[in-house]
């Protein structure tokens, strides 16, 4: 059962896992629901009835019959996880906390003109957890202005106390905020050579890649795979961190595999999400329950149902036994992962589901691409919608892209002379124009968010946002695609497609089904040579044939470039100007998303 | 109709610089390049560069970089080009022309051009 | 920069003659190849676009073909006031640059 709500003056008794510090309740209950095995927590607010080195303690708790009797105590706050929830869940905390000195290891200590500038160097610093400011009104002359950037091995501060005149705060490197660079690349036999803060065992080395990246400290890993020779370490995963931040020796060893943490593109892949299946593998812990079932995907729906399982390991039935249902062993740790891996026993085993809310929706797999052909199927672009404007009459104005379950993206130049959001209707899950009749239903749009620098498509800033005015259940045929990673900027995509009903301003003519063509990537180099007479910025992207052959009218103003990228789409780019549809060939100019993601997270993130 | 017209001969000294204008009318200014070209006398035609009258930006050919300016007064629907520290080499008709796309493309209307003579 | 080569340089051709200038590209220049006619002290006028899409006003004996980096203009019948100046122009990458010309004259 999912309960969101605070309990004030309530205490939970036992179950206590560990203690850690947070400035709020509401940080206490996402650090619970980030923990492996914390499903209640009870938080102690700062009070004069409290004895002050218990203010701000979160106390992580866990119970078989998922809860705990409850006992008043004046300060005392508790809760539930959100484990149990259905809905999205995100670690990014933005708050300030005024008048809060967190504690830690202060590794760096410089002057900076604001909270927010601290905030943001917390963010691009790879090391940094949490930080502390002291404003200008900091009675110590010499500490006025200093930013102090602290790590500890929790992620979370060793103590919180009262300290007047400072704010203090978290990176932001969860909010998708960081320029840090991201590495995907897994590197084969591999060693990284740097101090260990913790080793696990994982299934594979993206398992792995994926825990390092959810632990706090560390910044990269090492996995020694199956075949390893030292059999004591098979399996073993390996959560590596360093004062620089990289590893500082690479030895080249057979069988082992090494990577780096996720952290800077956790938003655009997914990092909590361990949905693979693992033959001939059995997982160790702490049994939960043994329950039949009839396949090792029904096993896996027991254990994402189950709160407490972590993983799970099925084993097939012989044959004609027990109505063909073999066995489901339910399984939890301390840390959520396997105390053990064993291989060659027959059993099929893997990790609970319900920790997929956590990552981006938008980093869902969606059906195989339909290959060949200028048409779409159903569901083969679940982010894409069609936007309607119902003055004079109902049509086609623009296509958009789903991002947020209230938040479509597309080209501000979509709206000139719109007047009011009320004309607009926004479609989804559209694939041909046909399907939308009267009774058809769709999203009014509450809000028409246009970049404030836009003054025209070819000047560039030519990005807008539709806040609907209801929210979007994802399906199938309606999902978000990604944002591109800051920290991506310097990936090449080899897999672009533009797509659209093929409506562009001028030419009145739509296809009546979702059109799509593969285009590739041009440099903005060779892009500023095509169109002399206008400036190709790094905030556009190219896209389009060198020559001829390839028709790039499919794609919609406003509609999506979308690539893919290790299986993950991004929006790449906006369908913005061009010269595409005519003789000429020339590339099409789209807005490169990568240089406004702040300001969409800014805009759909604003309280 | 379209029409583009051209300020007249001009004979200037080595080292100085010389304006030319180009007035526009018969279409929306704005919704079009103008570039510029020269013809040396018995040569062939070397462009030089471009001004987009809308956002006022200019390119220009590597050869005139540093010596060239192109503007554009939208209120008076007129381009200008400055070439600077001006050399014997620069003696030439020098004309402007509009882009037949929005976006560039092939020169559908010409001014009439502008004999530059440097001489001292 | 693209250099566009033209040939012949110069032409002889009498009325009524069917002539052919060609030009090459030193690289591929997709479709964005133009042609222009200039005559002494006067502005080139442009007839021929993307290839082979001819002008408004211009004559159908005027016609353009070819692909990538080879290019020809065809005058399928002289007329006394086609003996001029020839130029071909690439527009695919900038700076767009012209051909060295034709001098097309009475035989």
């Known amino acids: 059962e999912c309960v969101t709500q605070l309990l004030k003056d309530t205490c939970f008794e036992g179950g206590d896992i560990t203690t850690v510090f947070t400035p709020s309740a509401k940080y206490c209950q996402v650090v619970c629901t980030y923990h492996p095995r914390c499903l209640l927590f009870t938080f102690t607010a700062e009070s004069p009835s409290e004895d002050p080195t218990r203010w701000f303690t979160c106390v992580l708790k866990d119970s078989v019959t998922e809860t705990l009797p409850r006992v008043n105590r004046t300060a005392a706050i508790s809760g539930y996880s959100f484990k149990q929830c259905s809905h999205q869940i995100s670690a990014c905390n933005k708050d300030i906390y005024v008048d809060l000195d967190m504690k830690g290891i202060n590794y760096n200590s410089s002057v900076a003109k604001s909270a927010q500038e601290c905030q943001e160097r917390c963010t691009d610093d790879v090391h940094c957890h949490f930080f502390t400011y002291a404003t200008r009104q900091f009675p110590s002359l010499e500490h006025r202005n200093i930013c102090l950037l602290k790590h500890t091995q929790t992620g979370t501060p060793t103590r919180i106390t009262k300290l007047d005149k400072v704010v203090s705060g978290f990176s932001l490197k969860s909010c998708a905020l960081s320029n840090l660079a991201c590495i995907r690349d897994i590197f084969p036999n591999t060693v990284f050579a740097d101090s260990n803060i913790d080793s696990v065992m994982a299934p594979d080395a993206f398992v792995c890649g994926r825990i390092c990246t959810h632990h706090p400290g560390c910044l990269f890993f090492t996995f020694f795979s199956q075949e390893w020779p030292k059999e004591s370490q098979r399996n073993l995963c390996l959560l590596k961190t360093s004062e620089s931040g990289l590893p500082s020796t690479r030895i080249k060893k057979s069988k082992a595999l090494s990577g780096f943490s996720l952290q800077s593109c956790r938003h655009s892949i997914p990092v909590f999400c361990h949905s693979s299946f693992y033959h001939d593998t059995d997982f160790l812990g702490e049994e939960l329950d043994i329950v039949a079932a009839k396949s090792h995907e029904a096993c896996q729906k027991l254990c994402t149902n189950a709160v407490r399982c972590q993983f799970f390991t099925y084993t097939p039935a012989q044959a004609s036994c027990n109505e063909g249902k073999g066995k489901c062993y339910l399984k939890l740790s301390s840390n959520g992962s396997p105390t053990k891996i064993l291989h060659g026993r027959g059993g099929i085993s893997g990790y609970t589901l319900r920790l997929c809310k956590m990552d981006n929706e938008c980093t869902t797999k969606i059906k195989p691409r339909i290959v060949g052909g200028t048409a779409s199927v159903r569901g083969e672009w679940p982010w894409q919608v069609t936007l309607h404007t119902t003055s004079p009459t109902q049509r086609h104005l623009c296509g958009g892209s789903i991002i947020g379950n209230q938040w479509i993206l597309t080209a501000a130049h979509c709206f000139y002379g719109v007047e009011s959001p009320k004309i607009l209707r926004v479609y989804s899950g559209i694939l041909n124009q046909s399907e939308i009749k009267e009774d058809t239903s769709f999203f009014g749009v509450q809000e028409i968010i246009i970049h404030d620098q836009y003054k025209m498509a070819e000047s560039g800033y030519d990005i807008a946002l539709l806040k609907l005015e209801t929210t979007v259940n994802y399906t199938d045929s309606q999902r978000p695609i990604c944002l591109p990673s800051k920290g991506d900027r310097n990936v090449i995509y080899t897999d672009c497609w533009v797509t659209g009903w093929g409506y562009r301003k001028l030419r009145d003519k739509i296809q009546n089904t979702l059109q799509k063509a593969k285009i590739p990537l041009v440099t903005n180099e060779e892009c500023q040579k095509r169109y002399r007479g206008h400036k190709i910025t790094h905030k556009m992207i190219c896209a389009g044939y060198r020559e001829g052959g390839k028709d790039a009218c499919k794609g919609d103003s406003g509609g999506p470039l979308s690539c893919k990228h290790n299986e993950v789409w991004h929006l790449v780019g906006i369908t913005s100007w061009g010269e595409g549809c005519a003789q000429r060939e020339r590339p099409g100019v789209y807005t490169n998303v990568v240089e406004y993601v702040d300001w969409i997270l800014e805009k759909t993130q604003a309280v | 109709q379209v029409q583009l017209v051209q300020s007249g001969a001009e004979v200037k000294k080595p080292g100085s610089s010389v304006k030319v204008s180009c007035k526009a009318s018969g279409y929306a200014f704005s919704n079009y390049l103008i570039e510029w070209v020269r013809q040396a006398p018995g040569q062939g035609l070397e462009w030089m560069g471009v001004?987009?009258?809308?956002?006022?930006?200019?390119n220009y050919n590597e050869n005139f970089k540093d010596r060239v300016t192109i503007t554009a007064d939208e209120s008076t629907s007129t381009a200008y080009m400055e070439l600077s520290s001006l050399r014997s080499e620069d003696t030439a008709v020098y004309f402007c022309?509009?882009?037949?796309?929005?976006?560039?493309?092939?020169?559908?209307?010409w001014g009439q051009g502008t004999t530059v003579t440097v001489s001292s | 920069d693209i250099q566009m080569t033209q040939s012949p340089s110069f032409l002889s051709a009498s009325v009524g003659d069917r002539v052919t200038i060609t030009c090459k590209a030193s690289?591929?220049?997709?479709?964005?190849v133009a042609w222009y006619q200039q005559k002494p002290g006067k502005a080139p006028k442009l007839l021929i676009y993307y290839i082979s899409n001819r002008y408004t006003g211009v004559p159908s004996r005027f016609s353009g073909s070819g692909s990538g980096t080879d290019f020809t203009l065809t005058i399928s019948s002289l007329q006394p006031e086609d003996f001029a100046t020839y130029f071909c122009q690439q527009d695919y990458s900038s700076p767009p640059t012209f051909g060295q010309g034709t001098k097309l004259e009475i035989k």
């Open positions: 022309a509009r882009t037949y796309g929005k976006y560039g493309g092939a020169m559908d209307f």
């Open positions: 690289q591929s220049v997709s479709n964005d």
């Open positions: 001004i987009n009258p809308g956002s006022g930006y200019t």
